[in-house]
Every structure is written in structure tokens, then in C-alpha cells.
């Protein structure tokens, strides 16, 4: 806390300029009018204030706007944004995408801080949904942003926004998140032709059900093993050997290297060894010939 002291003669700031970098903290407190600071916030970022001087400027704004800063000030915070706490940011009402971009720019190249997370949360809640422009902006600054959202939060993403998603944006998503995103992606890309559709939908397939994988197997898509390994185990298990062969195309040979890992391991256990042998890959662990397979889940459904 800076002590209240009178401003020395001749030092009263008439505008926010570089001369202020030579002011001691108490002089900044005494000689800079908060209202002047608020109207000239756009200048602050161009002036190399020390971090301790920025603390004083923040204190002045806090006193002027105890209920939270107006957007006209927020948009020009620049480096001062780094001084804000999540509690400060929760008081803000940020509606402009330009304001959001300006503040994300300050934090660019760093991990998402609690301040940024709070800012994004406030912005998205204010908009009511995660529209395409917002998603474009957020994933540009934070490729992992989408996967940081809960399935409930992802449900507010409109299908049209899915066009903004790049494969790397989904790298850290878990199956529960892909379960929410996949149907949106399917809807978003539904009017594309086979090969183009597969290129777009591929990153989302970790949320695809069995029937969609069966449909893809009829389209010569040649899914790579990395994508196959991210599929839901429960969606892969009902696929036949023939369907997996069609789904993977020339990549089917990669199954051998993955035979000990899910979902390949579990899928092998469900196939007849006869059928696995037709692949000529030496996959072992299938159901021996002559054994009868009872699908107990089907039996329960019938009774």
C-alpha cells in the first residue's frame, strides 16, 4: 500500500507519458490522477513502467472502479493485465472479441494462466455460447483450449464452430470430450464428399460409434493406425475382421505392432482365430476354431 502524500510542486501529471518512469512509487500515487489514467490507458503499454510502478497504476484504477473496470479501460490494459487477479477479472464484463484478443496477446507464448482462464470464462459466459470467431481466437492462442473444457461446457459449442478446430486442438482431449464433439463434427461436415469428409472428421473419431466406423469401412478411407488406436474400445469391438481390414486398408499391417495394446488387444480377443489368420499378420489370441461365442449382453436384452 502506498502512503498518501502530497504531490511535489511541478510534478502533477498532465498526461500519461514516459516522464512518469522516473517517478517514485509515492509520486505516481500522489501525482497521477486516476481519471486521467483511465482515459489515457492506451499509452500505458508503450511506456516501460517497472512492475512495481504498474502496481501503483493498478491500485489507482481499483480505487476509481471498485465494481470492476469498464471495457474501454480493459481493452487497453496491456501489461497491466498481468497484474490482475482472477478476483479482479470476475468483476469485468468483456463483450468485445477485440478486447479478448488484446489481452490474450499480452500473455502470448505462456501457459494459460488463472487470469486468462477466468477472462475466457467471463467472455464465453457473456456470449452464451462458444461461437466460431471466439473459438478461432482461443485455439489460435491456446491450441489445447478445447480439451480444457468439460463435456458440459463443450455442449454449448455450435456445430458451425467446429470448422475452426484444427487436429492439434484435439490432441489432449479425452474420450468423454470427443463423445460430445464428434456428433457436432459429423453434423458440421455432413455435406462433404467421402475423402474430404474423412480428412475433416478424422481428428474427432475418438467419439465415433460402431455404426459410423462400419460406414467408413465401406468408403476406402485407409485410416492410419494412430487414428485407429484412439477409437473407443466399445466402438471397435463389434467390428469384423473384414471391416477392420477395409477401414485400415494398407495400414492393416500395423495391427501386429499394436496387438498388445487397446483397442487392438481387446478386439483380437473377440475375433475368431480363423478370421484373424486371413489377414496373414500372425495375430494371436482370437477365439479358437470350434468354440461357440455367447453374447451375454444380447441374451440379457432378450430376456
Amino acid at each position: 500500500e502506498v502512503e498518501k502524500t502530497a504531490c511535489p510542486s511541478g510534478k502533477k501529471a498532465r498526461e500519461i507519458d514516459e516522464s512518469l518512469i522516473f517517478y517514485k512509487k509515492w509520486e505516481l500515487e500522489a501525482c497521477v490522477d486516476a481519471a486521467l489514467l483511465a482515459t489515457q490507458m492506451d499509452r500505458v503499454n508503450a511506456i516501460p513502467f517497472t512492475y512495481e510502478q504498474l502496481d501503483v497504476l493498478k491500485h489507482k484504477l481499483d480505487e476509481l472502479y471498485p465494481q470492476g473496470y469498464p471495457e474501454s479501460v480493459i481493452q487497453h490494459l496491456g501489461y497491466l493485465f498481468l497484474k490482475m487477479s482472477p478476483e479482479d477479472i470476475r468483476k469485468w464484463n468483456v463483450t468485445s472479441l477485440e478486447t479478448l484478443k488484446a489481452l490474450l496477446e499480452v500473455n502470448k507464448g505462456h501457459e494459460m494462466s488463472p487470469q486468462v482462464a477466468t477472462l475466457i470464462d467471463r467472455f464465453v459466459k457473456g456470449r452464451g455460447q462458444l461461437d466460431k470467431d471466439t473459438l478461432d481466437t482461443l485455439t489460435a492462442f491456446y491450441p489445447g483450449y478445447l480439451c480444457s473444457l468439460s463435456p458440459e461446457e463443450l455442449s454449448s459449442v455450435p456445430p458451425s464452430s467446429i470448422w475452426a478446430v484444427r487436429p492439434q486442438d484435439l490432441d489432449t482431449c479425452d474420450p468423454r470430450q470427443l463423445d460430445v464433439l464428434y456428433p457436432k463434427a459429423r453434423l458440421a461436415f455432413q455435406n462433404m464428399n467421402g475423402s474430404e469428409y474423412f480428412v475433416k472428421i478424422q481428428s474427432f473419431l475418438g467419439g465415433a460409434p460402431t455404426e459410423d466406423l462400419k460406414a467408413l469401412s465401406q468408403q476406402n478411407v485407409s485410416m492410419d493406425l494412430a487414428t485407429f488406436m484412439k477409437l473407443r474400445t466399445d466402438a471397435v469391438l463389434p467390428l469384423t475382421v473384414a471391416e477392420v481390414q477395409k477401414l485400415l486398408g494398407p495400414h492393416v499391417e500395423g495391427l501386429k505392432a499394436e496387438e498388445r495394446h487397446r483397442p487392438v488387444r481387446d478386439w483380437i480377443l473377440r475375433q475368431r482365430q480363423d478370421d484373424l489368420d486371413t489377414l496373414g499378420l500372425g495375430l494371436q489370441g482370437g477365439i479358437p476354431n470350434g468354440y461357440l461365442v455367447l453374447d451375454l449382453s444380447m441374451q440379457e436384452a432378450l430376456s
Epitope: D17, E18, S19, I21, F22, K24, K25, A46, P48, F49, T50, Y51, E52, Y79
Partner: nanobody, 128 residues
Framework: EVQLVESGGGLVQPGGSLRLSCAAS????????MGWFRQAPGKGRELVAA????????YYPDSVEGRFTISRDNAKRMVYLQMNSLRAEDTAVYYC?????????????????????WGQGTQVTVSS
């Protein structure tokens, strides 16, 4: 890397004048501030003048106010210190310094902690 080279020091009589020059070379970018510090025998470094690189705003402590004038020539990357009405107590090694990074220390452009590049110094002796 930034190199700072001072020149212009020497022996001068009380009441006389000297003009120190500081040539900056190396990385070309806009500094936050440039300063002149001095260090008398057995004492710490003290700031005698500072100037912002972009706007040319200046700062002087009371001890030299009205006697010393700092200026800069951005195109030549030079900083000057015009010293008039010199006194015996102005005798010291004078250093040129550049502040290039946003810094943490309290009142940092007013003390040496705020400056990250330094020259070797030039001796100024005021004596009759």
C-alpha cells in the same frame, strides 16, 4: 549484446564545464532509458541524469539540477552529459548505462538496479 563506450572525461577547474559522450553499439533496438551514474572513491554509484530513449524525457536529482543536462541522438545512438558549474564534489568516475528490459526493482530507473548494460567509465576530476 550492447557495448557502451564513454569519452570526454578529464581534469577541470571548479566552475568549469565538461561534455561527456556515450556511444552505444551492438544490438540495435530502442532502449527504455539511458543514464549517467557516478562513483566517487569509497562511495556507491549514484544516478546524476537519465533520459527516456523514445520521448527524450529527463530526470535529474537535486544535487545536479540546473547544472547538468542529458541529451541523446537516436540516429547516432549517442548520449551526452553536459556538466556546467563543476564543483570539487563532482569528482568521480562517470558511467554510462542502458536500461533495456522491463524491470522489477523499486524506483528502478533511479538507481543502478534498473540498468543492465554499463560502460567502463571515464574519470572526471574537478580541482584547482
Amino acid at each position: 549484446e550492447v557495448q557502451l563506450v564513454e569519452s570526454g572525461g578529464g581534469l577541470v577547474q571548479p566552475g568549469g564545464s565538461l561534455r561527456l559522450s556515450c556511444a552505444a553499439s551492438g544490438r540495435t533496438f530502442s532502449y527504455n532509458a539511458m543514464g549517467w551514474f557516478r562513483q566517487a572513491p569509497g562511495k556507491g554509484r549514484e544516478l546524476v541524469a537519465a533520459i527516456t530513449w523514445r520521448g527524450g524525457y529527463t530526470y535529474y536529482p537535486d544535487s545536479v539540477e540546473g547544472r547538468f543536462t542529458i541529451s541523446r541522438d537516436n540516429a547516432k545512438r549517442m548520449v551526452y552529459l553536459q556538466m556546467n558549474s563543476l564543483r570539487a564534489e563532482d569528482t568521480a568516475v562517470y558511467y554510462c548505462a542502458a536500461a533495456t528490459a522491463r524491470v522489477y526493482a523499486d524506483d528502478s530507473y533511479l538507481n543502478e538496479s534498473g540498468y543492465d548494460y554499463w560502460g567502463q567509465g571515464t574519470q572526471v576530476t574537478v580541482s584547482s
